[in-house]
Interface confidence: low
């Protein structure tokens, strides 16, 4: 879990607490739903997505959803409940860090899902696990 | 109650600097993207510059890119803006302004300080 | 960056009367529009977000429609307190626009 930030005023329906009792807070997603991506054959990408939310309940994570068809590539940014199935997924890495792809099987197309759970973490969308960017440039996308 | 106070307006020449800060109490500061907003006198509402909670995305407005320097210091609960080369069309009332926590009010600005006047004259 | 117009840029009403300000953005925007007060000498106040949405502490008499790009704002019943420029900024992209804005004074 990451580690809660102290809220010095609360409302009562923001309150949801982890196993050990920590107090957890909603946290930052980008949070574009389906735009078209030029995100193809790469092992990183950014969303390229300019708007950061932060989602409606305490306990949603960031999701990404990467699809290609034989017409476009979408990428979807959203806030999404992890005890709740996404696109009939599971999202079995929400305690992650990093959004870190996994393909699913979808007939017609390829289909890439993560989902995480640090601040904006849905804006990095990694394909491949060893991938850590060192250009520091790469990660600051403009957003509102 | 959330109050956000701007000090640090002035009188200063063409070319000159500034820094303006904003104390920011009744919240938990680093959870909230804070954004600076100005207002030339007699004009309508300019937006200058976005930083995120943790200050590790900034965003600025390209009249003022590349002489303003947004920042903060959450273990102060502050928010700066560094304004360097100033211009008399940097003359203005300089608003700090807390964007709002919830997914569609991310990008509206739920809560402003009174504003500091910031005049470039010679 | 997207443009926000607003009209009317002025507009004379007296207490009591239903007052409908509009603005339209150059592209769409879907609902990612917010409006605010500002009286003389303060500072901005949000009454509406994502369009529709009534920020705490705002009177009912204020509400907004729209998506895409055009926009409404519309006060019930001006009250004298509502006299006024009021603003819209679109929130879809960085830069965030504002409107030109809409001065609502006494007839």
């Known amino acids: 879990t990451i580690p809660p930030h102290v809220q010095k005023s609360v409302n009562n329906d923001m309150i949801v607490t982890d196993n050990n009792g920590a107090v957890k807070f909603p946290q930052l997603c980008k949070f574009c739903d389906v735009r078209f991506s030029t995100c193809d054959n790469q092992k990183s990408c950014m969303s390229n997505c300019s708007i950061t939310s932060i989602c409606e309940k305490p306990q949603e994570v960031c999701v990404a959803v990467w699809r290609k068809n034989d017409e476009n590539i979408t990428l979807e940014t959203v806030c999404h409940d992890p005890k709740l199935p996404y696109h009939d997924f599971i999202l079995e890495d929400a305690a992650s860090p990093k959004c870190i792809m996994k393909e699913k099987k979808k007939p017609g197309e390829t289909f890439f899902m993560c989902s995480c759970s640090s601040d904006e973490c849905n804006d990095n969308i990694i394909f491949s696990e060893e991938y850590n960017t060192s250009n520091p440039d790469l990660l600051l996308v403009i957003f509102q | 109650e959330v109050q956000l106070v701007e000090s640090g307006g002035g009188l200063v020449q063409p070319g000159g600097s500034l820094r303006l800060s904003c104390a920011a109490s009744?919240?938990?500061?680093?959870?909230?993207?804070m954004t600076w907003v100005r207002q030339a006198p007699g004009k309508g509402l300019e937006w200058v510059s976005v930083?995120?909670?943790?200050?590790?995305?900034?965003a600025y407005a390209d009249s003022v890119k590349g002489r303003f320097t947004i920042s903060r210091d959450n273990s102060k609960n502050t928010l700066y803006l560094q304004m360097n080369s100033l211009r008399a069309e940097d003359t203005a009332v300089y608003y700090c302004?807390?964007?709002?926590?919830?997914?569609?009010?991310?990008?509206?600005?739920?809560?402003w300080g009174q504003g500091t006047l910031v005049t470039v004259s010679s | 960056d997207i443009q926000m117009t607003q009209s009317p840029s002025s507009l004379s009403a007296s207490v009591g009367d239903r007052v409908t300000i509009t603005c339209r953005a150059s592209?769409?925007?879907?609902?990612?529009l917010n409006w605010y007060q500002q009286k003389p000498g303060k500072a901005p106040k949000l009454l509406i977000y994502a369009a529709s949405s009534l920020q705490s502490g705002v009177p009912s008499r204020f509400s907004g429609s729209g998506s895409g790009t055009d926009f409404t704002l519309t006060i019930s019943s001006l009250q004298p307190e509502d006299f006024a420029t009021y603003y819209c900024q679109q929130s879809y992209s960085t830069p965030p626009t504002f409107g030109q804005g809409t001065k609502v004074e006494i007839k």
């Open positions: 592209q769409s925007i879907s609902s990612y």
């Open positions: 930083i995120s909670g943790s200050g590790g995305t900034t």
């Open positions: 302004a807390r964007r709002g926590q919830y997914r569609y009010i991310a990008g509206a600005t739920d809560y």
């Open positions: 009744g919240f938990t500061f680093d959870i909230n993207a």
